[in-house]
């Protein structure tokens, strides 16, 4: 399928978004401007925008200003300056600031907790299925199958550490070779990037915010997919990861270390364990083909158990089956031997909500999935709101400058590498790349961090999660130490290789450009974000899985033509943009294809028809519900009261001329009042964060 023409203008000047440019970005137009810009991408940029009825002056935008929708928005301060406040005002403002900080930390805490619960919910819903994916014998011979199993399992359990630990236990039990495990680890790396993409979907309400958040989240996806695209064939051909890691493991005489420090879990566990506790061993047991485990529940019931080891007499078919000749005898009727058995006695039940409900795993998982997504969404909305009120004026300027500015020349190139280290360090602290990248996503959305800066932070996060795995491997018991360490190192070197591929040279930073392209499409057609999520994390892996089960011939028979078409389209796209004269007139653009193959417009019409029923029942009262609604239907008329969808009626009517949005006014509160959103009396109570 050919690319859509929308992509053509998505980024007129890709070189503009290099690391170096981050520091000195021009002042951005306001959110609404950007919104209108995306509403009609084909419209010439220089068009004079129509003014709102309440405006008294004709404001003409400089074309340079509107040019780049990726510039960070100016979060203007509507509050009274600190120096102009009286003592009472200062005290009030101080306590407001403290209150906001406490609220921010509180919501951040529940945000992280909801991510943990979300992972548990996914494990309850799909954990057993995930375990069964691993028991497929074809993994050994088919690296592509291993890759998609890694993706699917990690998506299903929402935790790369869970899927990696299953792989480790399978390798140490000789059910899997390190060679077969490497593609699974690569897949787990891809699967883990779904979490922050889901988090980005929560910011769907505001087009420009969503554009940035979704691009910021998917930069992780594209980095992982592109790394696999290059490194999996390299690994299959050379086995470089296996060889390097084997040399490292063999050259060091490792002693069992201590457990990797649980830093964030120390704070979140007391809360999350009151909600639900899981017996993670069940998934591993299913992966190891343990038939008994298939009937076990993942919900942990007994937290305190007493394990007693005893020897019992058991019958064996013949003396050849005895544990040892000395421990073998017959009673003249049957042959007997001694067997060590572990008798587990339940002492105390766990203290969580679901302990006495005895509900099936699917029911518990579904309940937790819905609740955790609601809490996640609610917390995210509140975090964005609080950050929006805190990060204004001087504070915003300082933070933005600190985060997004490069080191002075000639050390500018070092900034990104420092960001990688910061990302790795932060991930090591929170012990989860999902948590770190998910926390980063709303910050990208509201415009505190540029995608150019978020990219190295995300790459660092990938490294950070592998260092955690290395520490965990060093704490493994003797028999699992070698395999777990080698797999952790494979994960580490895979990410290092990916960084070397897609970071040092600005030209190779394809994930940024691809993420921005996807951000533009998703901002215009918001349903495409969900479509992308389903396609890349479910349909493609499931298709490859199905084809792999059918055998190599089927996989190659279907795969080769598909890959050939993709390469052909990419080459044609490259020639169209770089040197179109080389191509025949017909191939210089995509107009020779039917509209549905080159544009999302017809698809959008189909989706709009399909979601028409939702538009009618669009809810204004509930913000969370509204955001979900806006994601499904690009409804222009609904949710105006909650400012969830910023489309104006003109956009629906297909007008070419963008409407000047009220946010263009210097004082944001005036524009809000004009819309009837904020009572005039409240405008002066705004307090700039300290």
């Amino acid at each position: 399928m050919a690319p859509w023409p929308e992509l053509g203008d998505a980024q007129p000047n890709p070189d503009k978004y290099l690391e170096g440019a981050a520091g000195q970005q021009p002042t951005a137009p306001d959110k609404s401007k950007e919104t209108n810009k995306t509403d009609n991408t084909e419209a010439p940029v220089t068009k004079i925008e129509l003014l709102p009825s309440y405006s008294t002056a004709t404001l003409i935008d400089e074309p340079t200003e509107v040019d780049d929708p990726w510039n960070l928005p100016t979060l203007q301060d509507s509050g009274i300056k600190w120096s102009e406040r009286d003592t009472k005002g200062k005290i009030l403002c101080f306590f407001q600031g403290i209150g906001r900080l406490i609220l921010l930390l509180g919501f951040l805490y529940f945000f992280v907790c909801s991510l943990d619960i979300l992972s548990s919910a996914f494990q309850l819903v799909g954990g057993k299925m995930a375990g069964q994916f691993f028991s497929n014998s074809s993994i050994m011979s088919n690296p592509l199958l291993g890759l998609v199993i890694g993706v699917l399992v990690t998506v299903l359990v929402q935790s790369s550490s869970t899927s990696t630990s299953i792989v480790v236990s399978m390798v140490s039990s000789s059910l899997l070779t390190v060679r077969a495990a490497i593609p699974i680890i690569m897949g787990a790396n891809i699967g883990t990037s779904i979490t922050n993409t889901i988090v980005a979907l929560m910011q769907v309400g505001d087009r420009s915010e969503f554009r940035r958040a979704f691009a910021g989240a998917t930069v992780h996806d594209f980095f992982n997919w592109l790394s696999v695209l290059v490194l999996l064939p390299v690994e299959v051909a050379t086995h470089y990861l296996e060889i390097i890691t084997q040399l490292i493991v063999e050259s060091f005489h490792f002693k069992n270390g201590e457990d990797a420090p649980d830093l964030l879990k120390v704070i979140t566990k007391p809360f999350t364990k009151l909600i639900v506790q899981l017996d993670k061993k069940v998934i591993s047991q299913i992966a190891m083909n343990d038939e008994k485990a298939k009937n076990k529940s993942l919900v942990k019931i007994w937290c305190k158990t007493f394990t007693n080891k005893t020897q019992i007499n058991v019958t064996v078919p013949s003396t050849a089956n005895c544990t040892s000749p000395s421990l073998c005898w017959t009673d003249g009727i049957q042959n007997w031997t001694m067997k060590n058995v572990t008798y587990k006695e339940n002492i105390a039940k766990c203290q969580h909500i679901f302990v006495n409900f005895h509900l099936p795993d699917l029911a518990v998982g579904t309940i937790l999935l819905i609740l955790s997504l609601l809490v996640l969404c609610g917390c995210l909305i509140m975090i964005v709101k609080i950050l929006g009120s805190v990060l204004k004026g001087q504070v915003a300027t300082v933070i933005k400058k600190t985060i997004n500015t490069d080191f002075p020349f000639p050390f500018a190139w070092l900034t990104g590498y420092l960001a990688i280290l910061v990302g790795a360090g932060m991930t090591f602290i929170v012990q989860s790349s999902s948590v770190f990248t998910s926390a980063l996503t709303p910050l990208i959305g509201i415009g505190v961090i540029t995608i150019e800066r978020a990219y190295p932070l995300t790459l660092g996060s990938n490294i950070g999660t592998t260092t955690t795995a290395i520490l965990a491997a060093l704490a493994s018991p003797g028999n699992a130490l070698r395999s777990s360490l080698q797999i952790a190192l494979c994960h580490f070197f895979f990410n290092i290789s990916g960084i070397l591929l897609w970071y040092p040279i600005p030209f190779t930073r394809l994930p940024i450009r691809m993420a921005k392209g996807l951000g533009n499409i998703s901002a215009k057609y918001r349903w495409f974000a969900v479509f992308y999520l389903i396609i890349f994390f479910f349909l493609i892996p499931l298709t490859v899985f199905g084809l792999s089960l059918a055998g190599w011939r089927v996989l190659v028979g279907v795969g080769v033509p598909v890959v050939f078409i993709i390469i052909l389209v990419l080459c044609l796209r490259l020639l169209q943009s770089r040197c179109p004269r080389v191509l025949p007139k017909k191939l210089q653009n995509w107009n020779f294809l039917p509209l549905w193959m080159r544009s999302l417009k017809p698809w959008d019409a189909v989706v709009s028809k399909f979601t028409g029923c939702f538009q009618m029942r669009c809810c204004c009262c509930c913000r969370v519900c509204c955001r979900a609604c806006c994601l499904l239907c690009d409804c222009p008329k609904c949710c105006r009261c909650s400012k969830c969808c910023e489309d104006l009626e003109e956009a629906q009517e297909g007008q070419d001329v963008p409407v000047k949005a009220p946010e263009t006014f210097d004082n944001i509160t005036i524009s809000r009042e004009a819309q009837g959103e904020v009572p005039a009396s409240d405008s002066k109570t705004e307090c700039t964060a300290l």
Partner: antibody, heavy 120, light 112 residues
Framework: QVHQQQSGPELVKPGASVRISCKAS????????IHWVKQRPGQGLEWIGC????????KYNEKFKDKATLTADTSSTTAYMHLSSLTSEDSAVYFC?????????????WGAGTTVSVSS | DVLMTQTPLSLPVSLGDQASISCRSS???????????LEWYLQKPGQSPRLLIY???NRFSGVPDRFSGSGSGTDFTLKITGVEAEDLGVYYC?????????FGGGTKLEIK
């Protein structure tokens, strides 16, 4: 006290079947074999077979394979012998005996016997 | 099947006398594990059998020491020194080494 309580005497018609029981008490039922022995009036003893309640393993004398079926119910600590297609040849006293199978093998505890009379 | 032949069929004794019962097997009754599983049982009229000797020569608990067993391979003997009135009944030898397990025909110990 270790004891094997057998069911009362049975009078059955030829061709019919009968189930006699042997209730064990005073020991761990699942740790010992229960053997069944036949004694026709004025004659010697014949070993029929045995069952191990721990795993319900059974061993039969080929001569009685089609005649006797041994079962055990661990919850009621009772062993059963089902005799089918009875003829006058099956009229006898049937004993159940506990068999000690560790170190030495022997029948250390016997039931009082169940008299089965086959008569038309 | 291993045939166990007991002699004599009937043994009349006076109280206080020594009695000797012989049991011969049609083949060696030594088990593959080295044990010779030969037992002697006494059945009094109207009662169930009672164990006297196991593994050829081992007296079962509660059995008086006037009972002794001996033999090896295929020939085995039960000796009672100083017969008492309570010793009267039918004595059976039993082999539990080869399936099917078999009893001897029995020897009736009676007063002269």
């Amino acid at each position: 006290q270790v004891h094997q309580q057998q069911s009362g005497p049975e009078l059955v018609k030829p061709g019919a079947s009968v189930r006699i029981s042997c209730k064990a008490s005073g020991y761990t039922f699942t740790s010992y074999y229960i053997h069944w022995v036949k004694q026709r009036p004025g004659q010697g003893l014949e070993w029929i077979g045995c069952i191990y309640p721990g795993n319900l393993f059974t061993k039969y004398n080929e001569k009685f394979k089609d005649k006797a079926t041994l079962t055990a119910d661990t919850s009621s600590t009772t062993a059963y012998m089902h005799l089918s297609s009875l003829t006058s040849e099956d009229s006898a006293v049937y004993f159940c005996a506990r068999f000690l199978n560790w170190n030495a093998w022997y029948f250390d505890v016997w039931g009082a016997g169940t008299t089965v009379s086959v008569s038309s | 099947d291993v045939l166990m032949t007991q002699t004599p069929l009937s043994l009349p004794v006076s109280l206080g006398d020594q009695a000797s019962i012989s049991c011969r097997s049609s083949q060696s009754i030594e088990h593959s594990n080295g044990n010779t599983n030969l037992e002697w049982y006494l059945q009094k009229p109207g009662q169930s059998p009672r164990l006297l000797i196991y593994k050829v020569s081992n007296r079962f608990s509660g059995v008086p020491d006037r009972f002794s067993g001996s033999g090896s391979g295929t020939d085995f003997t039960l000796k009672i020194t100083g017969v008492e009135a309570e010793d009267l009944g039918v004595y059976y030898c039993f082999q539990g080494s080869h399936f099917p397990w078999t009893f001897g025909g029995g020897t009736k110990l009676e007063i002269k």
